[in-house]
């Protein structure tokens, strides 16, 4: 099992959440470990049991406090480590020094909502989530429309370069129904990666008004 | 494009020690990792130790663990294998390589972890 392909990547939420992903070829399903966070300027530990997620896949949530508390700053360096339970005693199996503002993922968008719909066109607003303080404006989003006879895979990304929480969407068909969704990304971190899509929002564009030309 | 280049190797006798040391330049990770393996003559390359970006993680081959010490300079980009009590069978030519990730530990020992690596240095113990 040491010798097959292993992954561990972790991502800090920018407030206090680590999620963790551990992944080992030949792993046995039911191997108990876990994830240990040892901060190198907090008075804190935190451990996490891995879950299975898949096959030769394991997750867990390292939870710093409550969700919107800064619990880490750019200066922090959390060791993590992975250990398995091996008969009686428990093996590292990995570590990692993690900077957590070089390994962001941000919590999905929240409260889409229409703000004004139309015949063509359609704004939307939505809420940034457990985000720090310290980005300030240095966010961008993507977002994507979902037409009828299409799959979100086939919708092409709309991206806003700056902290924008809002959107007008225009040429659209009335009378249709379309879905929307919406992701965030810091500009901060090598290892940062786009936030899970929104929930989608589902709306309608209003009806032609009959005999007119719109 | 980072490069790696190794130092310190030459020939000494069996109970000695050397150390060596891998200069990196060229870029930099945020929080890499780095190691040492080892090839020998007619034989794969070897994991032999690795640590992480802060150093508060190391990682030995059983092989080696208790006579060699990893370490780490950042200020100088450099890292450096202690090696005590050298046995001939400790032969081989010594690669620095990089792992831009910063994993390391037993499941990460496979040199594909590794993105980047030095061109070696001989290291030769004589009985």
């Known amino acids: 099992a040491v010798n097959g392909t292993s992954q561990f990547t972790c991502f800090y939420n920018s407030r206090a959440n680590i999620s963790c992903v551990w992944s080992q070829d030949g792993a046995l399903q039911d191997t108990s470990c876990q994830v240990h966070a040892w901060p190198d300027r907090r008075r804190w530990n935190q451990t996490c049991e891995l879950l299975p997620v898949s096959q030769a896949s394991w997750a867990c949530n390292l939870i710093l406090g409550a969700p919107d508390s800064q619990k880490l700053t750019t200066v922090d360096i959390v060791t993590l480590r992975v250990l398995c339970r091996e008969g009686v005693r428990w093996r590292v199996m990995a570590i990692q020094d993690f900077k957590p503002f070089e390994n962001l993922r941000l919590m999905a968008p929240i409260s889409l909502q229409v703000v004004h719909v139309e015949t063509h066109r359609c704004n939307i607003s939505w809420e940034i989530s457990q985000a720090s303080h310290y980005f300030e404006r240095h966010l961008e989003f993507e977002a994507r429309t979902l037409s009828p006879g299409h799959t979100w895979e086939e919708a092409p990304l709309l991206t806003l370069k700056q902290k924008q929480e809002w959107i007008c969407l225009e040429t659209l068909t009335p009378d249709t129904q379309y879905e929307f969704q919406v992701r965030v990304k810091p500009l901060q971190g090598e290892f940062t990666t786009w936030s899970p899509w929104s929930q989608p929002l589902a709306f309608r564009t209003k009806p032609a008004a009959l005999g007119k030309d719109t | 494009q980072v490069q790696l280049v190794e130092s310190g190797g030459g020939l000494v006798q069996a109970g000695g020690s050397l150390t060596l040391s891998c200069a990196a330049s060229?870029?930099?990770?945020?929080?890499?990792?780095k190691a040492w393996f080892r090839q020998a003559p007619g034989k794969e390359r070897e994991f032999v130790a690795a640590i992480t970006w802060a150093g508060r993680g190391t990682d030995y081959a059983d092989s080696v663990k208790g006579r060699f010490t990893i370490t780490r300079d950042n200020a100088k980009a450099t890292v450096h294998l202690q090696m005590n009590s050298l046995k001939p069978e400790d032969t081989a030519v010594y690669y620095c390589?990089?792992?831009?990730?910063?994993?390391?530990?037993?499941?990460?020992?496979?040199?594909?972890?590794?993105?980047?690596w030095g061109q070696g240095t001989q290291v030769t113990v004589s009985s």
């Open positions: 060229g870029g930099a990770f945020s929080s890499d990792a």
């Open positions: 390589a990089l792992n831009p990730r910063g994993v390391i530990g037993p499941a990460f020992r496979n040199s594909n972890h590794y993105t980047y």
